[in-house]
């Protein structure tokens, strides 16, 4: 079938990075500068994307693949092809429909994007809170209360049970 197809359509022999040039007897010509063809058998090459303004070049255009953009620092991409840039929030915030909002008590976000996540519930693992959580950081769980009974070797006392920032029980 492939042989039949190539006999019928000489363009099918043109590999990625070339185009089937009708002006030159359907010879496979290389894509001109700033253009590419990612599949074989194409009759034209596509113009390379230019990453301008808020968009930065993540991957240069080649004869077989388009350029890829990302966003300038302080912004992150929206969509598979990074067609828009959206402002990052700060750590300790999440982007809501109303913009960047601080994480609610009992939740944290240690990144500049994504959502606030609940603090780890240490007691579910039979552990106690060693370091209280904040908007930016999860709680740090320590040894279980049983491990801290008299004679146990731990030197770090558990945090008081009702202190602000304590993981919800």
């Amino acid at each position: 079938f492939e042989r039949t197809r190539s006999l019928q359509d000489p363009c099918s022999n043109c590999p990625a990075g070339t185009f089937c040039d009708n002006n030159r007897n359907q010879i496979c010509s290389p894509c001109p500068p700033n253009s590419f063809s990612s599949a074989g058998g194409q009759r034209t090459c596509d113009i390379c994307r230019q990453c301008k303004g808020v968009f930065r070049t993540r991957k240069e255009c080649s004869s077989t693949s388009n350029a890829e953009c990302d966003c300038t620092p302080g912004f992150h991409c929206l969509g598979a092809g990074c067609s828009m840039c959206e402002q990052d929030c700060k750590q300790g915030q999440e982007l809501t429909k109303k913009g960047c909002k601080d994480c609610c008590f009992g939740t944290f976000n240690d990144q500049k994007r994504g959502i606030c996540r609940p603090w780890t519930n240490c007691s579910l693992d039979g552990k106690s809170v060693l370091v209280n959580g904040t908007k930016e950081r999860d709680v740090v769980c320590g040894p279980s209360p049983a491990d801290l009974s008299p004679g146990a070797s731990s030197v770090t006392p558990p945090a008081p049970a009702r202190e602000p920032g304590h993981s919800p029980q």
Epitope: K52, G53, F75, G79, S83, E86
Partner: antibody
Framework: QVQLVQSGAEVVKPGASVKVSCKAS????????MHWVRQAPGQGLGWMGA????????DYNQKFKDRVTMTADTSISTAYMELSRLRSDDTAVYYC?????????WGQGTLVTVSS | DIQMTQSPSSLSASVGDRVTITCRAS??????LNWYQQKPGKAPKLLIY???RLHSGVPSRFSGSGSGTDFTLTISSLQPEDFATYYC?????????FGGGTKVEIR
């Protein structure tokens, strides 16, 4: 806060040129493309073109390609749009706007009236 | 060029009404669709970007949906300050193009 402030209204004669300025503040001017959009009285919005202040590279709407020139001066965070060979149907409000893939901040607009 | 067709071109509604404006692109624009609100004598203001993301400070009664070629702006409960003209705009390809606008008037 991020702001775009445009030059004042202009009355110009047919055949003449007009140059509208757009001064940016509150952000890194060179880091964002500036686009220009116009709106004739009682009409909708029409995209004219864009400039990348960092490189001076431009993209123009074919409709204006031979009459429009967009420039930018990064030292004073200002973009310019010059339209030549003005006709009466160029009477419009001209807006500059910052691009993130969407136009998040707009200038207040500059009314250009073409009249003899 | 990608043509953007908005409907209706105008509508009359009352405070509290649910209002829906549609925008159709002449070819696939994925989710690269933005909505703007404009009041007389003022510059347009961004409402929604990337089809459904609310710009900061925009009330949650505004929402957007769709993908490909068909998109919708919905105002769940119209408020007096929402009487304005609304424009859709595609960012898929240059030239950037706008819909013709939908004027929302008081009934």
């Amino acid at each position: 806060q991020v702001q775009l402030v445009q030059s004042g209204a202009e009355v110009v004669k047919p055949g003449a040129s007009v140059k509208v300025s757009c001064k940016a503040s509150g952000y890194t001017f060179a880091g964002f493309e500036m686009h220009w959009v116009r709106q004739a009285p009682g009409q909708g919005l029409g995209w004219m073109g864009a400039i990348d202040p960092k490189t001076g590279g431009t993209d123009y709407n074919q409709k204006f390609k031979d009459r429009v020139t967009m420039t930018a001066d990064t030292s004073i965070s200002t973009a310019y749009m010059e339209l030549s060979r003005l006709r009466s149907d160029d009477t419009a409000v001209y807006y500059c706007t910052r691009d993130l893939g969407y136009f998040d901040v707009w200038g207040q607009g500059t009314l250009v009236t073409v009249s003899s | 060029d990608i043509q953007m067709t908005q409907s209706p071109s105008s509508l009359s509604a009352s405070v509290g009404d649910r209002v829906t404006i549609t925008c159709r692109a002449s070819q696939d624009i994925r989710s690269n669709l933005n909505w703007y609100q404009q009041k007389p004598g003022k510059a347009p203001k961004l409402l929604i970007y990337y089809t459904s993301r609310l710009h900061s400070g925009v009330p949650s009664r505004f929402s957007g949906s769709g993908s490909g070629t068909d998109f919708t702006l919905t105002i769940s409960s119209l408020q007096p300050e929402d009487f304005a003209t609304y424009y859709c705009q595609q960012s898929e390809k240059l030239p950037r193009t706008f819909g013709g606008g939908t004027k929302v008037e008081i009934r």
